[in-house]
């Protein structure tokens, strides 16, 4: 004959305020006959949770039909659960006695408590952008959650990071707790695109952890590249002047000519293009006319990258007498 | 199966005692409780007493209260009443019940006992 | 104590009726209350316990109802071995009793 055990799988149940809680308790064995009560706590001043005789237990409903003579499944729900309700509470077997019934055999408790969800993780980034090969500090915050144990993670595109620091507060016993975590990103040049996310794992997610995330493109700043080319003349007295400026980020720029120092106004044609990795692309042609010109004409590139101090390239024209001579109907 | 086997009919004289046996089998005698009940003829059912099969505690009815002692014995599996004192309002079929659930219920009776007190 | 009132003390019904028996506690006894059946010469037999569960073995015709201070024993259609005294018995608390019983006679 298989010996009684009073079976309570949940150590810990974590409940919310309002909600409906369910304490788990099996039997192994119907025998022997005797009713199964529900108390919090231990010892003399236990309180009695749910007796199917006697008392008014209003927000105690039985999971199972206690009626039935096979039935060894005393769990049982509260309802409307309040701050009040936290405490272990134990299932307990007795055999029928008199004047009062003699405890036979008690389960080992679930300890209720009050379990708060963490709110949604709120990454941010640098006030200021960065250029690659820097470090910028992301911080991830999450708030009113309980009980205090929970976990952080970092991760950039996918692969999880491990430069970060992470604070619970408050230290002591609370009613919910706040978590804060820094992580320091090196910027790559191709971290247009990337993201960072913040993960955050809690006892009451049920294993499905919430997620912050920034976009990387909110804190790099890609300076761009210069190159001033001539090209092969196209029409008559004219040279056509190109200034390529590669891989930058964000799009914020400003291109000026300048010819022999001077500011020109007039500038042919240009073209934004975007690369792959999220950086831009833009040329910018300008033509000059070399009739009657001079052999040192300097002409200067110059661009103001989100407000950044402005880089420039320059290029000394060749203009060779056989350009100049050239009629209007050459060919590059 | 779960049996109850009461004793024998007994005829007594007034101020008598008996001794009546029930003998389980079946069953564990430790796991259950036993109540015992008796009917005058022709008349309904009366309430005597209960047992606990676990530790021998006992509760009896008000108005056989001293003269009524229900015991156990777990090596034989055998439950006992005596009545003691008795009187001619005492004759009846005296049943032994097991205690079925937690719901008290009686799902197993005894085949009962006679007991006639007559001078 | 609990007082248990049984009604009627006896009736008359033919095969194929439909019988209800009424008990009522002096008290509140929530589902305490078990039914018996009782043939004569016989000890009684467990019906109903817990104010509605069906004993394994015993047919579905009968079925109790009730909760609190007022209970219900019901055959739904009366077969020829279903004459006999049925008895209410609250189980609620010490002393335990029982119903004065019903006859159920044949018409």
């Known amino acids: 004959e298989e010996e009684l055990q009073m079976i309570q799988p949940e150590k810990l149940l974590l409940v919310t305020v309002g909600k409906t809680a369910t304490l788990h308790c099996t039997v192994t064995s119907l025998l022997p006959v005797g009713p199964v009560l529900w108390f919090r706590g231990v010892g003399p001043g236990r309180e009695l949770i749910y007796n199917q005789k006697e008392g008014h237990f209003p927000r105690v409903t039985t999971v199972s039909d206690l009626t039935k003579r096979n039935n060894m499944d005393f769990s049982i729900r509260i309802s409307s659960i309040t701050p009040a309700d936290v405490g272990t509470y134990y299932c307990v077997k007795f055999r029928k006695g008199s004047p009062e019934n003699v405890e036979f055999k008690s389960g080992p408790g679930t300890e209720m408590a009050l379990g708060a969800k963490p709110s949604a993780p709120v990454v941010l980034g640098p006030a200021a952008r960065t250029t690659p090969e820097h470090t910028v500090s992301f911080t991830c915050e999450s708030h009113g959650f309980s009980p205090r144990d929970i976990t952080l993670k970092w991760f950039k595109n996918g692969n999880e990071l491990s430069d970060f620091q992470t604070n619970v507060d408050p230290t002591g016993q609370s009613v919910a707790y706040s978590i804060r975590s820094t992580a320091r990103v090196v910027l790559d040049p191709w971290d247009v695109r990337s993201q960072v996310i913040c993960e955050v794992a809690h006892v009451t997610l049920q294993g499905d952890p919430l997620r912050g995330t920034a976009n990387l493109s909110e804190a790099i700043r890609v300076p761009p590249t210069l190159e001033v080319t001539q090209q092969p003349m196209r029409v008559g007295n004219q040279v056509n002047v190109t200034c390529q400026v590669r891989k930058f980020y964000p799009q914020s720029l400003q291109l000026t000519w300048s010819e022999n120092g001077n500011v020109c106004q007039r500038e042919t044609a240009s073209t934004l293009t975007e690369n792959k990795d999220g950086t831009y692309n833009w040329t910018s042609w300008f033509l000059v006319n070399i009739s009657d010109q001079r052999d040192d004409v300097v002409l200067t590139c110059q661009v103001k990258h989100d407000g950044q101090l402005a880089v420039s390239k320059r290029l000394a024209l060749e203009v060779t007498v056989h350009q100049k001579d050239q009629s209007s109907d050459a060919t590059p | 199966q779960v049996q109850l086997v009461q004793s024998g009919a007994e005829v007594k004289k007034p101020g008598a005692s008996v001794k009546v046996s029930c003998k389980a089998s079946g069953y564990t005698l430790n796991n259950y409780d036993i109540n015992w009940v008796r009917q005058a003829p022709g008349q309904g059912l009366e309430w005597m007493g209960w047992?606990?099969?676990?530790?021998?505690?006992?509760n009896y009815a008000q108005k056989l209260q001293g003269r009524v002692t229900m015991t156990r014995d777990t090596s034989t599996s055998t439950v006992y009443m005596e009545l003691s004192s008795l009187r001619s309002e005492d004759t009846a079929v005296y049943y032994c019940a097991r205690v079925g659930s937690s719901w008290e219920e009686n799902d197993q009776w005894g085949q009962g006992t006679l007991v006639t007190v007559s001078s | 104590d609990i007082q248990m009132t049984q009604s009627p003390s006896s009736l008359s019904a033919s095969v194929g009726d439909r019988v209800t028996i009424t008990c009522r506690a002096s008290q509140s006894i929530s589902r305490w209350l078990a039914w018996y059946q009782q043939k004569p010469g016989k000890a009684p037999k467990l019906l109903i316990y817990a104010a509605s569960s069906l004993e394994s073995g015993v047919p579905s015709r009968f079925s109790g109802s009730g909760s609190g201070t007022d209970f219900t024993l019901t055959i739904s259609s009366l077969q020829p071995e279903d004459f006999a005294t049925y008895y209410c018995q609250q189980t609620h608390s010490f002393p335990l009793t029982f119903g004065g019983g019903t006859k159920v006679e044949i018409k």
């Open positions: 047992i606990s099969g676990y530790n021998g505690n006992t």
